[in-house]
Interface confidence: low
Amino acid sequence: EEELQVIQPEKSVSVAAGESATLNCTATSLIPVGPIQWFRGVGPGRELIYSQKEGHFPRVTPVSDPTKRNNMDFSIRISNITPADAGTYYCVKFRKGSPDVELKSGAGTELSVRAKPSAPVVSGPAVRATAEHTVSFTCESHGFSPRDITLKWFKNGNELSDFQTNVDPAGKSVSYSIRSTARVVLTRRDVHSQVICEVAHVTLQGDPLRGTANLSEAIRVPPFLEVTQQSMRADNQVNVTCQVTKFYPQRLQLTWLENGNVSRTEMASALPENKDGTYNWTSWLLVNVSAHRDDVKLTCQVEHDGQPAVNKSFSVKVSAHPKEQGSNTAAENTGTNERNIY
């Protein structure tokens, strides 16, 4: 005697999220009479996916008309697949009765959902760091399936190697997340640099997703200070120049002090950008030497991006022979420096 078989020809089906999944099922006999039902999972907790008899299943469409008397094809199409639909689906034949009795189940078809990773989001450090320091950038992407994924980091097109990547969860899941942290050593030339996190996944058909972060958000390039004095003018006025160069970001305050007293404070604004993204600024102070009897200590004080102030000082010695005034050499580039000018 020929026994009814329920055949599910595919052991597994893989579908991209948003697409439809077709789950095939054939019953080899019209006898005995009774409905077919589809379940996800096994045992008492299994989930009813489709029933010929009853219920509302808006996303499920039978491939063939199950009401036709001679129908033996009980394949279904599930629309708009999401990662939550992953699992093993069973086509089950029931014998008509009160209640219906489960007769035979197919071997099951595992549905795996290929879900695209979300656009990678790259976040940088909360506070700026200076050149030669190492900063961390984090890249996150979520919601992808299957779990296999490749993540690469680039800085200005060059692949980075110092990074750690985790894919969660470790076990089986309907979808996964990836988190990677890259360590990047900053240089003074990095204002225009960019880090890119590139995620490659089977769902992307060779078109990886990229997330970017600009190092301009993470870097602080402290200024160089150079204080110089021009030749004394005929009217006994000395023009002292404070050159503040190669700094980023633009937020900078410059204060001139004469003998420790604030003479003038200026804020940098609308400065032209250097090719490397940094800024330069020059400030002048005109000092009337004849108005001073004693030496004049001039200090150019620069506060950059909320950092402690950097000072450069000159001691201008009031001379009996002002016309012999020469030009002073630049002060040192660090710390507080004093020069006597004769």
């Epitope: 948003g18 697409e19 656009a119 225009h192 960019q194 769902t203 078109d207 970017t212 600009n214 301009s216």
Partner: antibody, heavy 121, light 107 residues
Framework: QVQLQESGPGLVKPSQTLSLTCTVS??????????WSWIRQHPGKGLEWIGY???????YYNPSLKSRVTISVDTSKNQFSLKLSSVTAADTAVYYC?????????????WGQGTLVTVSS | DIQLTQSPSSLSASVGDRVTITCQAS??????LNWYQQKPGKAPKLLIY???NLETGVPSRFSGSGSGTDFTFTISSLQPEDIATYYC?????????FGGGTKVEIK
């Protein structure tokens, strides 16, 4: 409410460089959160996306035009610009500047009124 | 590049009619799709973003649906001021691309 206004010559000779500027008012380019794009429309035809720039200077150009396109930004003037080199009659179009949400959810939610550029000798 | 195929390319309908435009993507773009309205001599105006979300200030007679590769734009009751060309645009992949447009006219 942000407004965008294109400006530049309406006539460009073949082989020369087309230069357009988009001035943004009612919002700051440098506040972030948006891409600043150029889109063009050939007479009686559909829309073609040219590329975008972020306030930081990051750009992406349509590969079909990449070799000829430069988009730049001047945050101090709240402007961004398009340069298209080696133009031909096929570059005759209405050029639009537009603002697009960085997260992609809001589309090009603000556009300029467009400026017609004719390439002819 | 992602191709977006809009259909029909033009249609003529009466005031009060329900108008439906479709946009098919050459590959899965999830719901990363916008719909624009462009009136003659004007810049495009965003109507629908993320396939189904109505942009602020846009009349509720406009709607959108779909996900993956097949999308639909509907005007539930056509008004004279709706005479325009309508474009779909994908932003799932760079470069962003537009559909060829659907010109809507009044009978």
């Amino acid at each position: 409410q942000v407004q965008l206004q294109e400006s530049g010559p309406g006539l460009v000779k073949p082989s020369q460089t087309l230069s357009l500027t988009c001035t943004v008012s009612g919002g700051s380019i440098s506040s972030g959160g948006y891409y600043w794009s150029w889109i063009r429309q050939h007479p009686g035809k559909g829309l073609e996306w040219i590329g975008y720039i972020y306030y930081s200077g990051s750009t992406y150009y349509n590969p079909s035009l990449k070799s000829r396109v430069t988009i730049s930004v001047d945050t101090s003037k709240n402007q961004f610009s398009l340069k298209l080199s080696s133009v031909t009659a096929a570059d005759t179009a209405v050029y639009y500047c537009a603002r697009e949400g960085l997260d992609g959810s809001y589309g090009s939610s603000a556009w300029g009124q467009g400026t017609l550029v004719t390439v002819s000798s | 590049d992602i191709q977006l195929t809009q259909s029909p390319s033009s249609l003529s309908a009466s005031v009060g009619d329900r108008v439906t435009i479709t946009c098919q993507a050459s590959q899965d773009i999830s719901n990363y799709l916008n719909w624009y309205q462009q009136k003659p001599g004007k810049a495009p105006k965003l109507l629908i973003y993320d396939a189904s979300n109505l942009e602020t200030g846009v009349p509720s007679r406009f709607s959108g649906s779909g996900s993956g590769t097949d999308f639909t734009f509907t005007i539930s009751s056509l008004q004279p001021e709706d005479i325009a060309t309508y474009y779909c645009q994908q932003f799932a992949y760079l470069p962003y691309t537009f559909g060829g447009g659907t010109k809507v006219e009044i009978k």
